[in-house]
Interface confidence: low
Amino acid sequence: SERCDDWGLDTMRQIQVFEDEPARIKCPLFEHFLKFNYSTAHSAGLTLIWYWTRQDRDLEEPINFRLPENRISKEKDVLWFRPTLLNDTGNYTCMLRNTTYCSKVAFPLEVVQKDSCFNSPMKLPVHKLYIEYGIQRITCPNVDGYFPSSVKPTITWYMGCYKIQNFNNVIPEGMNLSFLIALISNNGNYTCVVTYPENGRTFHLTRTLTVKVVGSPKNAVPPVIHSPNDHVVYEKEPGEELLIPCTVYFSFLMDSRNEVWWTIDGKKPDDITIDVTINESISHSRTEDETRTQILSIKKVTSEDLKRSYVCHARSAKGEVAKAAKVKQKVPAPRYTVELACGFGAT
């Protein structure tokens, strides 16, 4: 067969859909690989062809678009299942071609089962709500394009297994779920079930997402360095191990990159000849505030090392801070027993 630009199996787009529900899957070629859209391709005389490989098989097969009630159909660049079945799981390929051009990509589709409480192997999107921030909303995701705007679906919201009605601070408003004041107790999985009619049939769309209540930007502060501080002096004798922890608290900030680093005499440890190691640990609070600890360690410190400047730095979207550790050389205690003994003429 003639050459075809094969983009391979696009595992970045691992598509999961629920069994016995409608699913609409766009050919990824136009979204991520080609610089033109389906309409342009169609106008240029290119044809979109679909085929698939069943789970645990190597054989590529055409998709059967002649099933009863048009269970599987194609519309423009979308492959429709009305509804899905478990054995629809497999790798699907969409190929765009004419006599002189060919491009194709495959993607995995997994049809998953859910139980009566909406538990399933589905990977859930996480929606973060700010704690005690005023009214915030989540929206039932990925339901666009399933029904025309003239169709008014019914939407039922659940928290875990429970239908949301008469909850104190959570109110269903159609496609939206409003949290009047988000609290830690609102953490959990929320499911919207969208029911709509089509050609005399009733379809259900189930969408579950995880709500995580996080620190509010109203309470966010620049990084706080707890250690090193002015109260602790790292007093060492040459040859001893020097351990200095840098412990920094970061308020939760959406999409903020939290950084901690040490400088020694103004240089990064990598740029200096000392044998220094740095170990980092990270912990999080319930609202995803972060505490990072970086321990600077010099196994056998020299008197030169004890004269250097050790500074802990921290940066977040809220600002940058730095704190120097107080490091000094321990003055050896006088060895009185020997000196006094010598003074009295002992041998």
């Epitope: 005023g134 009214i135 909850f167 104190n168 601070n169 408003e173 009047l180 930007p217």
Partner: antibody, heavy 117, light 110 residues
Framework: QVQLQESGPGLVKPSETLSLTCTVS????????WNWIRQPPVKGLEWIGY???????NYNPSLKSRVTMSVDTSKNQFSLKLSSVTAADTAVYYC???????????WGQGTLVTVSS | QSVLTQPPSASGTPGQRVTISCSGS????????VNWYQLLPGTAPKLLIY???QRPSGVPDRFSGSKSGTSASLAISGLQSEDEADYYC???????????FGGGTKLTVL
């Protein structure tokens, strides 16, 4: 139909504490934020603060040191106390519900409180 | 001195269109939604516009709201004598961690 009604003394002496109560009828104090807003004579509206059913509060920073709000879920009421009042605290005091859209969608009729000896 | 700035007065003749502006900053209007309230003499304030431009049920479509950057405006078309009232804009202020109002605009129907 949710309705709000303010009640309390219309006259308070300087340096004393102003106390008002808002009764919620036709609905519950559970959920929503319950706010106090005031309007001094020939001046604009000023937000005093809010309370929720669990007792969580947020006060106007300029009044914070003098304001205390409380809620009584059994009576479906919430209250405002403003200490050390002066003539500048003379105003029509409104209670209002902060609804689903971050807006005061239901208001009480307002009660005029005069601070005078 | 109000955090949000409104013109103290506005006027128009019946049938005309009037616009009331509300100017703020990045910590209030710039990052939060704007609401508008109508205060008719002797009655409780009434929510006129929420979430920048949404009208609660019962508010005539003659009232419309808009927001751009750190400013918002309320437009009243087909002005009627019963529209004579005080109008206030309001928004949450992230810096003050509280609700702020404009100074109010007195609308006179000539």
């Amino acid at each position: 139909q949710v309705q709000l009604q303010e009640s309390g003394p219309g006259l308070v002496k300087p340096s004393e504490t102003l106390s008002l109560t808002c009764t919620v009828s036709g609905g519950s104090v559970f959920s929503y934020f319950w706010n106090w807003i005031r309007q001094p004579p020939v001046k604009g509206l000023e937000w005093i603060g809010y309370i929720d059913h669990s007792g969580g509060t947020n006060y106007n920073p300029s009044l914070k040191s003098r304001v205390t709000m409380s809620v009584d879920t059994s009576k479906n009421q919430f209250s405002l106390k403003l200490s050390s009042v002066t003539a500048a605290d003379t105003a029509v005091y409104y209670c209002a519900r902060e609804g689903l859209h971050d807006a005061f969608d239901i208001w009480g009729q307002g009660t005029l409180v005069t601070v005078s000896s | 001195q109000s955090v949000l700035t409104q013109p103290p007065s506005a006027s128009g003749t019946p049938g005309q269109r009037v616009t009331i502006s509300c100017s703020g900053s990045s910590s209030n209007i710039g990052s939060n939604t704007v609401n508008w309230y109508q205060l008719l003499p002797g009655t409780a304030p009434k929510l006129l516009i929420y979430s920048n431009y949404q009208r609660p049920s019962g508010v005539p479509d003659r009232f419309s709201g808009s927001k751009s950057g750190t400013s918002a405006s309320l437009a009243i078309s087909g002005l009627q004598s019963e529209d004579e009232a005080d109008y206030y804009c309001a928004a949450w202020d992230d810096s003050l961690n509280g609700r702020v109002f404009g100074g109010g605009t007195k609308l006179t129907v000539l």
